[in-house]
Interface confidence: low
C-alpha cells in the first residue's frame, strides 16, 4: 500500500507510470499501484527518490536528451534537484529541461527540452502535479543532533532506510539518521511519531491532564520548533494560567538556556497571541521584556531567570516546549447568535442572547463605567469569539477613533487578566505591541480602540466612554421582527438577504436552487460579513454549507458564480492546496473556515440576494 | 513562499548616497515586517532599520542618514543611504518577517 507520501508518476498521453527497472534503467509501464517499482516520494525540496531502490531520480548532466536514472542520493548534487514548472511540467532546477517519456526508440525517461504532453505528469489516480505531495522536514527529539531533521534515505549498517526505523535498538524507540551516513557521522535523533515508549517523551500534569515535552537539548528557529510541535499533533507551549507556569518552572528548574514558546507578535496589525490561538490573558515577562525592537517577535521561557519570558528574533536556535491534550480554558460554550431569542431594551443591541449598548458620549474612569453598566442589570462588556468583537465593530455604531472600556482588567491579580462580569478568557485580540503593561503607570484596565477595535490595556483612572453588555430577557410576548427588504424564512444583514437551503445537493444544484430563488450562492465581500456567515451556519450540526466561490472555470483560480472580485478570504490550514474544486464553510470548531471540496460532494448551502429597496452602492473602480 | 531580490548596491566614495530596492514576489500577502540587514567580512549579520506597519527602527549607527520606506502597491521596499562612510561596506540583506524570508544580498562598498 503506498504511505501518504508516496505517489506514482503518471503520463496521461500514455496512461502509463515511471517503473524503476533498476538503478540504470526508469521506463514506463502500466500503472501498478502495489508495484514497489513505481513508488516514489519527495525526500528533500528537490529530490525524488525511487522507494524500490532507495535511489534518487537525477541525470550525468544538464543537457538536452540524457538519460534519468537513480543515483545514491545526494543532497548537494545539482543533477538530482527537480521542480515543478508551471502546471505539470517537472524539470531540472534551474534549466529548462524536463522529465520527459522518450520516445518509440528510447523506452528510458529523458531529459529534454521540449514541454509538450510527454513532458507532462501527474500522481497517478489525482489531477496533482507531483509537488502537491511534498516533501515535510521530519524534526528530530532526544538523540546527539540538536533536532536537526531526518536524512532520507541514511545508511545503517550499510543498508539504507527510507523511513525511520528502530534497527539497532531493542527498546522499539524509532529513529532517523540526520546525514545520509549514519554509519560515518553517527548523529541521530528520535522520530516525532507515535511508537511503544514516545509517551514517555512527555510530562503529564496531573492536575490537568496536559503534556507537556522539553526538548531543551535542540536548535531550532521558533518557526521550526512549532512545526515539530505540529507533527507530533501538538503546539508550541502557551500558558493562561498561573498554575501552569508554576508547574512548568518546576520542569525546566534544572535547565539554562531558553526555550521557544508559542506567544509571538508575527501578526501584522495585532499584537502578543499564542500560537495555538489561547487567549493572551496572563503575563509573565522578564524585566525589560517585551522589548519593542522590531524582529523580536518571538518568545522564549527562561528557565534560568526563573522561566520569565523575553522576546527574541524568530531565527535564533534555541530547545522549544510543547503542549497537548486538554487545553487548560475552561470549556465554555458561547451560543449561537440563531440559537437564542433576544429581546433588548430600547437602544440596546441583541447578539447572540445578550444585549450592548455603547456609552459614548458620557466618559467615565473604568470603576464608574462599570458601577453604571450594573445598575443598568449588566456590566463592563466581556468578549468571547471573533464574531462578537466583529458584531461589536460593524453593528453596535462602534467607530475607529474611539476608545471605550471593555470589562478586562488584571486588578485582582497583576498580570493576570480576567472579565469583570465573571466568565472566563477564551480569546483576546490585542493590539500591536499590547498589553504593554507599562510599569510607572499601572495599566491594570482594558479599552477596545482603533479601526478594528483591538485591545489595548491603560490606566484605570482614564475618563472615557465604555460599553455595557446584559443577558437579553426573554420573558414578554415573543417580537417576531420581520427583516425588512427580506422574504419570509430569510434573514437580513447590511444590504442582503441570506437563506439556508436545508436540501443536501452538489455546488451545481446548489447554485440552480438559489438561482430558482432569484438569488446566487453566497458571496463574502469581508470579515463583517463572514462573522455574520459564521455566526448563521458556525454551530449547526452539519459539516458543511456551500458558498458561490470555486475553480471550476479556471483549474487553481477561484470565482465567485457571480461577476465579482475575490477580495476576501478565509481559508482553513492547508487550503485551498492545489487540489481543484468548489468552496464550503466549515461548522464547529473550525466554524467559517474555507474548505476545498469536491464539487459533487453533498452539503447544505447558503443563497443571497439585494435586499428589496436597497440603494446599490457604486462598485469599486479598479 | 516569499521570495525577495535586492538591487542597488555598489562602490560610493565616503560622503555619497546610493538606494537599496527590496522587491518581494510570492505570497507577499503574508508580509508583516520587512526589515535591512547587514554583514560585514567576519562580524555578525546586524539588523540596519525595519518597518512594521507605519513604525520605523534604525541602528543607532545610521539614524539620520539612512531611510527606509515601502511602497506596498509595488511591493517593494528602500532603503535611502546618505553621508555614507567607509564602516558601512557589507553586504546588505533584505528581510520578510523578521527572519523567515531572506534575499540573496547585494554588495556596498564605500571607498574612503
Known amino acids: 500500500l503506498l504511505d501518504t507520501r508516496q505517489f506514482l508518476i503518471y503520463n496521461e498521453d500514455h496512461k502509463r507510470c515511471v517503473d524503476a527497472v533498476s538503478p540504470s534503467a526508469v521506463q514506463t509501464a502500466a500503472c501498478n499501484q502495489d508495484a514497489e517499482s513505481q513508488k516514489f516520494r519527495w525526500v528533500s525540496e528537490s529530490q525524488i527518490m525511487s522507494v524500490a531502490f532507495k535511489l534518487c531520480l537525477g541525470v550525468p548532466s544538464k543537457t538536452d536528451w540524457v538519460a534519468i536514472t537513480l543515483y545514491a542520493c545526494d543532497s548537494k548534487s545539482e543533477f538530482q534537484k527537480w521542480e515543478c514548472k508551471n502546471d505539470t511540467l517537472l524539470g531540472i532546477k534551474g534549466e529548462d529541461l524536463f522529465f520527459n517519456y522518450g520516445n518509440r526508440q528510447e523506452k528510458n525517461i529523458m531529459l529534454y527540452k521540449g514541454s509538450g504532453l510527454w513532458s507532462r505528469w501527474k500522481i497517478y489516480g489525482t489531477t496533482d502535479n507531483l509537488c502537491s505531495r511534498g516533501y515535510e522536514a521530519m524534526y528530530t527529539l532526544l538523540g546527539n543532533a540538536n533536532g536537526a531533521t531526518c536524512a532520507f534515505p541514511f545508511k545503517f549498517e550499510n543498508k539504507w532506510y527510507a523511513d525511520c526505523t528502530s534497527a539497532g535498538r531493542s527498546d522499539g524507540w524509532l529513529w532517523c539518521g540526520t546525514t545520509t551516513d549514519y554509519d560515518t557521522d553517527k548523529l541521530f535523533g528520535y522520530c516525532p511519531l507515535k511508537f511503544e515508549g514516545s509517551e514517555s517523551l512527555w510530562n503529564k500534569d496531573p492536575l490537568t491532564s496536559v503534556s507537556y515535552q522539553i526538548n531543551s537539548k535542540s536548535a531550532l528557529t521558533w518557526h521550526q520548533a512549532r512545526k515539530s510541535c505540529q507533527q507530533q499533533n501538538a503546539e508550541l507551549l502557551s500558558i493562561t494560567e498561573i498554575h501552569e507556569q508554576t508547574y512548568l518552572t518546576g520542569l525546566t528548574s534544572s535547565l539554562t538556556s531558553g526555550l521557544w514558546i508559542g506567544l509571538n507578535s508575527l501578526s501584522f496589525n495585532s499584537g502578543w497571541q499564542w500560537s495555538d490561538r489561547s487567549p493572551f490573558r496572563y503575563l509573565n515577562w522578564l524585566p525589560g521584556s517585551p522589548s519593542a525592537e522590531p524582529g523580536k517577535s518571538c518568545v522564549s521561557l527562561n528557565p534560568g531567570k526563573n522561566a520569565k519570558w523575553e522576546n527574541l528574533e524568530c531565527v535564533q536556535k534555541l530547545g522549544y516546549i510543547c503542549k497537548k491534550g486538554n487545553t487548560t480554558l475552561n470549556s465554555f460554550v458561547i451560543p449561537s447568535e440563531s440559537d437564542v431569542p433576544t429581546h433588548c431594551p430600547s437602544q440596546w443591541w441583541p447578539y447572540a442572547g445578550h444585549c450592548y449598548k455603547i456609552h459614548r458620549d458620557e466618559k467615565k474612569i473604568q470603576r464608574d463605567a462599570l458601577t453604571t453598566c450594573r445598575k443598568e442589570g449588566g456590566d463592563l462588556t466581556s468578549i468571547h469569539t471573533i464574531e462578537e468583537l466583529d458584531f461589536i465593530i460593524s453593528q453596535l455604531g462602534y467607530e475607529p477613533n474611539d476608545e471605550l472600556w471593555i470589562g478586562l482588567n488584571d486588578i485582582k491579580i497583576q498580570m493576570y487578566f480576567e472579565w469583570s462580569d465573571g466568565t472566563p478568557v477564551t480569546f483576546t485580540k490585542w493590539l500591536r505591541g499590547e498589553p504593554s503593561h507599562e510599569n510607572n503607570r499601572q495599566e491594570d484596565c482594558v479599552v477596545m480602540k482603533g479601526k478594528d477595535g483591538y485591545w489595548a490595556d491603560r490606566g484605570c483612572e482614564w475618563p472615557l466612554g465604555y460599553i455595557c453588555k446584559m443577558k437579553s430577557r426573554s420573558q414578554g410576548p415573543e417580537i417576531v421582527e420581520v427583516e425588512k427588504g427580506c422574504r419570509k424564512g430569510w434573514k437580513k444583514h447590511h444590504f442582503y438577504c441570506y437563506m439556508i437551503g436545508h436540501t443536501l445537493s452538489t455546488f451545481a444544484e446548489a447554485n440552480q436552487t438559489c438561482n430558482n430563488e432569484n438569488a446566487y450562492l453566497t458571496t463574502i465581500e469581508d470579515r463583517y460579513e463572514q462573522a455574520f456567515l459564521t455566526s448563521f451556519v458556525g454551530l449547526r450540526p452539519e459539516k458543511y454549507f456551500w458558498t458561490g466561490l470555486s475553480d471550476i472555470q479556471t483549474k487553481g483560480t477561484f470565482q465567485w458564480t457571480i461577476e465579482e472580485e475575490v477580495r476576501f478570504t478565509h481559508w482553513n490550514s492547508d487550503m485551498p492546496g492545489r487540489k481543484p474544486g468548489c468552496v464550503a464553510m466549515r461548522t464547529g470548531i473550525a466554524g467559517g473556515l474555507w474548505d476545498v471540496l469536491k464539487c459533487d460532494e453533498k452539503a447544505k448551502f447558503v443563497c443571497k440576494h439585494w435586499a428589496e429597496g436597497v440603494t446599490h452602492p457604486p462598485k469599486p473602480t479598479t | 513562499q516569499v521570495q525577495l531580490q535586492e538591487s542597488g548596491g555598489g562602490l560610493v566614495q565616503a560622503g555619497g548616497s546610493l538606494r537599496l530596492s527590496c522587491a518581494a514576489s510570492?505570497?507577499?500577502?503574508?508580509?508583516?515586517?520587512m526589515g535591512w540587514y547587514r554583514q560585514a567580512p567576519g562580524k555578525q549579520r546586524e539588523l540596519v532599520a525595519g518597518?512594521?506597519?507605519?513604525?520605523?527602527h534604525y541602528a543607532d549607527s545610521v539614524k539620520g542618514r539612512f531611510t527606509i520606506s515601502r511602497d506596498n502597491a509595488k511591493n517593494t521596499m528602500y532603503l535611502q543611504m546618505n553621508s555614507l562612510k567607509p564602516e558601512d561596506t557589507a553586504v546588505y540583506y533584505c528581510?520578510?518577517?523578521?527572519?523567515?524570508?531572506w534575499g540573496q544580498g547585494t554588495q556596498v562598498t564605500v571607498s574612503s
Open positions: 518597518i512594521t506597519g507605519g513604525n520605523t
Open positions: 528581510n520578510a518577517n523578521w527572519g523567515a524570508y
Open positions: 510570492g505570497s507577499t500577502f503574508s508580509i508583516n515586517n
